[in-house]
Amino acid sequence: AFGISGVQKYTRALHDSSITGISPITEYLASLSTYNDQSITFALEDESYEIYVEDLKKDEKKDKVLLSYYESQHPSNESGDGVDGKMLMVTLSPTKDFWLHANNKEHSVELHKCEKPLPDQAFFVLHNMHSNCVSFECKTDPGVFIGVKDNHLALIKVDSSENLCTENILFKLSET
């Protein structure tokens, strides 16, 4: 749809790419919801956080996550249009000292408590897939995205450009 000849084309260098510095260039708070407007919520259970995908009641407050944007070290000019910008990676933190992590072995998305510098599993390449939606691709596993499966977040392999706009890997960011 966007002249993509496969996900790998844009992220093949992810395994080798490092983050410029240890400080994000930009941070802000936003709530995260699915393409179908279900909210991503976080609950403390038995001293660990669980992540849920659920419909909120009308006046129920949405959980916010801190989105931190980091520049990759090398310009990502694979697109062929002479773009000289640096690829952006994000980390997502719903509460202090906890970050979303990709567990590639279990194909799951988990909240881990950790100190900076954050591990590679906490970084996701940001994509604009579809109108006002974004997607999050694992830095540690190109072609694998955060997605929704059985009312939970999971890691979903996307193996062709046609599947890039599949609804279960599309998310909306909202500041309200």
Epitope: F2, Y28, Y69, L126, H127, L173
Partner: nanobody, 121 residues
Framework: QVQLVESGGGLVQPGGSLRLSCAAS????????MGWHRQAPGKQRELVAV???????NYADSVKGRFTISRDDTKNTVYLQMNSLRAEDTAVYYC???????????????WGQGTLVTVSS
């Protein structure tokens, strides 16, 4: 190619005001956020303010209540209204945007060349 062009910098007295503008152009498909950073001589570049596509904003503590960021989505332009300027606001102000192009879904970070703001009597 994506270009960011800043304007509006200059010399202003303490307590004065300036309005910076930054226009993004090129093969832009979606802009996620636009913001301003600054770099004073001998210091690291720091975030001043950012405004997201949804209208959310974030400000550095040092400029809260004095600076206001806004954007015009129709023109892919961001503005920084700077009031009650102080000597310590003297810096080169850089526009930064996160955007994707028509040829790639990957969101990239783009920077302008910078505009100098000098606050001095």
């Amino acid at each position: 190619q994506v270009q960011l062009v800043e304007s509006g910098g200059g010399l202003v007295q303490p307590g004065g005001s300036l309005r910076l503008s930054c226009a993004a152009s090129g093969s832009i498909r979606t802009v996620n956020y636009m913001g301003w950073h600054r770099q004073a001589p001998g210091k690291q570049r720091e975030l001043v303010a950012v405004v997201t596509s949804g209208g959310g904003t974030n400000y550095a503590d040092s400029v809260k209540g004095r600076f206001t960021i806004s954007r015009d989505d129709t023109k892919n332009t961001v503005y920084l209204q700077m009031n009650s300027l102080r000597a310590e606001d003297t810096a080169v102000y850089y526009c930064n945007a996160a955007a994707s192009t028509y040829s790639s879904t990957v969101v990239r970070s783009f920077w302008g060349q910078g505009t100098l703001v000098t606050v001095s009597s």
